[in-house]
């Protein structure tokens, strides 16, 4: 594709999602003459950068350039050379970098500075690297899924793009789970909000939206696990932690220094009489669930209703798309089907967690062990977060749709971010040009 003439005027955009556990590069394309239409932008490539998230490069910033090379070279390959100079590149860093910034603004700035210098060396139109806020992450995720589901379009279609799409224009709520934070974003029934911090107003395609959003820092699946370990080791009698969230027979040595490295475990930090401890899995869903619930403070709420930790949460409304790690984990566990009830999910989790580690390794040969070992915890955490954290019930569970992709594009904040920064979501409904919405004639 490198130098072939394009049959129509196609534009491209690149967004790098610098997450806490890894970085992914997304390439989007759209027909230039339709860039204000809804649903015309789609993802053509995802490239996962090898290695950890950029915040882990704080002590080796000189390696950041080489770290990004493979995926940036892939972008150079996928996007026609004639388009390189006009292709915008954006990098948004999320909770991993928010945590680093909490520890040291100077170190976070240094990492971003090196990232910017590295990305400026490519022939694209680099537009900057920044740490996006939790509110932005929630809002852009909400925009992405509703854009892809066609919820902003004023035209009713006689066909359905995806199985759970209805022809009504009610937007979907967005549930996003990362490694270091989790976001919940939706349009509540009641337009007035008790917490202005959680309120966003948008005008998109001629319609006003009053949106609730909150990002829970330290409640992504990886940081939640660190929190749980730090909490549980406080009461361990020796350097062995019998952990119900890992399979029977699983063993792993953890350095106490690694445990207390993150700001997320500060509230549990104490002087321990050992430098290392060993996790020994006992695989008990019920006990794991109980341990996870202790991470959510539900005893204090200064509003009419809260999620946890005193954060306002209005009554849940409508359907929700649950993506990123919500999807990856539930998909691995084979629990994404609309037909699987919450009770069935709990039952399956009990069974899964109790399976011996050696059996799990054999059954799932080829699944990376680091991830494989944590699915029991992650699945339990997801259930706890959705049910006790966000107050979904057995009945409202059926309103949660676990989504990986919508029409070939990953659900996540990156598309919404690019649409916003390239001004591709107009406030007003664009005037329809002749034939622009018709099928081919």
């Amino acid at each position: 594709t490198q130098n072939k003439a394009l049959p129509e005027n196609i534009k491209y955009g690149i967004v790098l999602d610098a997450g806490s556990s890894h970085t992914s590069l997304y390439i989007y394309k759209w027909p230039a003459e339709k860039e204000n239409d809804t649903g015309v932008v789609h993802q053509v490539e995802e490239c996962r950068v090898k290695g950890p998230g950029i915040s882990k490069y704080v002590q080796k910033v000189n390696e950041i350039g080489i770290y990004l090379t493979d995926c940036m070279e892939r972008a150079r390959e996928v996007i026609p050379r004639s388009q390189h100079q006009e292709t915008p590149v954006y990098l948004g860093a999320t909770a991993g970098m928010r945590l680093l910034r909490m520890e040291s603004e100077e170190l976070a700035d240094r990492v971003l500075d090196v990232v910017e210098r590295s990305l400026s060396n490519y022939p694209f139109d680099f537009q900057g690297a920044r740490i996006i806020t939790g509110q932005e992450e929630g809002a852009y995720g909400w925009i992405t899924i509703n854009y892809l589901l066609g919820k902003f379009s004023q035209k009713t279609r006689w066909f359905s793009i995806v199985p759970y799409e209805t022809n009504n224009q009610e937007t979907f709520g967005a549930l996003d789970l990362g490694g270091a934070s989790t976001q919940i974003t939706f349009v509540p029934q009641n337009q007035t909000t008790e917490s202005p911090d959680n309120a966003l107003q948008f005008r998109l395609y001629g319609k006003d939206y009053n949106v609730y959003t909150h990002s829970f820092l330290c409640y992504g699946k990886d940081q939640a696990l660190w929190q749980k370990l730090a909490k549980d080791i406080q009461v361990a009698s020796n350097e062995i932690l019998r952990d119900p969230c890992f399979h029977p027979g699983y063993k792993k040595v953890v350095n106490v220094s690694d445990l207390y490295k993150t700001p997320c475990t500060k509230r549990f930090e104490m002087t321990l009489p050992f430098q290392q401890f060993e996790i020994q899995g006992i695989g008990n869903y019920q006990q794991c669930h109980q341990s996870v619930l202790e991470l959510f403070n539900t005893s204090y709420c200064p509003y009419s209703q809260c999620a946890f930790n005193g954060i306002f949460l209005p009554p849940l409304q409508g359907d929700f798309g649950a993506f990123s790690a919500f999807y990856f984990v539930m998909n691995f566990l084979n629990l994404t089907s609309e037909k699987v009830s919450q009770e069935k999910v709990t039952e399956m989790m009990k069974k899964f967690c109790s399976q011996p580690w050696e059996e799990i390794k054999t059954s799932y040969a080829g699944v990376k062990e680091k991830y494989l070992s944590e699915y029991c915890f992650s699945g339990t955490y997801i259930l706890s977060l959705l049910l006790q954290g966000y107050h979904f019930t057995a009945d409202s569970w059926e309103h949660i749709h676990f989504i990986g992709k919508i029409q070939g594009s990953d659900a996540g904040w990156t598309l919404g971010y690019m649409l916003n920064l390239t001004n591709m979501i107009p406030a007003e409904q664009p005037l329809s040009t002749p034939l622009s919405h018709s099928t081919y004639v």
């Epitope: 490198q2 890894h22 490539e45 995802e46 490239c47 996962r48 950068v49 090898k50 290695g51 950890p52 390696e63 080489i66 493979d70 995926c71 070279e73 892939r74 150079r76 390959e77 390794k361 040969a365 080829g366 699944v367 990376k368 062990e369 680091k370």
Partner: antibody, heavy 123, light 107 residues
């Protein structure tokens, strides 16, 4: 079926330049990376560098100043050139295929290797 | 550079025995580790990638495990054709690096 075949000079004088050609069949150079690895008596297996499907290169900094990798896609050939040879460069030079999985972030796995080109650096 | 240390450097085992080879990385490499088998005069063959994924066509008696810094290659029920040198390789960071090899022979 997938094959890679290295052809080299066998004997090279010290200070001279080594040139090896890797001819591939059964796959396209524009879909795979082509890696170079050598095995020397002193250092065992050493990764040297590679050329990506798009044509850009990555080198091991231990060789960077004297190594260059290029290709001719019309002939299905990849070329390794290394100058300023020393006796320690004596060994077997392999080209190998690397199937990049961008979605998974897996690249650097050498799934098919050539039979190797034996190189002796001696005067 | 990431150092890959293999142990033992050599070992002898009897037919039908189970063999374990260890590979230790000098820093966390996640699961970005491959195992290769090399017979004298032949080119290396890929056995395992991503720490534990079996390459197509490789007998199921070979298995890999581990993540982070500790990895192992296990050969169940050793066969005569398994006599070879085994190498591990990390591919998380440039330069990619190999272990020094483990020479396996029959007792």
């Amino acid at each position: 079926q997938v094959q890679l075949k290295e052809t080299g000079p066998g004997l090279v004088q010290p200070t001279q330049t080594l040139s090896i050609t890797c001819t591939v069949s059964g796959f396209s150079l524009t879909s795979y990376f082509t890696q170079w690895v050598r095995q020397t008596p002193g250092k065992g297996l050493e990764w040297m560098g590679f050329i990506r499907s798009g044509g850009s290169t990555q080198y091991n900094s231990a060789f960077k100043s004297r190594l260059s990798i290029s290709r001719d896609t019309s002939k299905n050939q990849v070329f390794l050139k290394m100058n300023s040879l020393k006796t320690e460069d004596t060994g077997v030079y392999y080209c190998a295929r690397d199937r990049p999985d961008y979605h998974d972030g897996t690249y650097g796995v050498l799934d098919v290797w050539g039979q190797g080109a034996s190189v002796t650096v001696s005067s | 550079d990431i150092r890959m240390t293999q142990s033992p450097a050599s070992l002898s085992a009897s037919l039908g025995e189970t063999v374990n080879i260890e590979c230790l990385a000098s820093e966390d490499i996640d699961s970005d580790l491959a195992w290769y088998q090399k017979k004298p005069g032949k080119s290396p063959q890929l056995l395992i990638y991503n720490g534990n994924a079996l390459q197509n066509g490789v007998p199921s008696r070979f298995s890999g495990s581990g993540s982070g810094t500790h990895f192992s290659l296990k050969i169940n029920s050793l066969q005569s054709e398994d006599v070879a040198t085994y190498f591990c390789q990390q591919y998380i960071n440039y330069p990619y690096t190999f272990g020094g090899g483990t020479k396996l022979e029959l007792r």
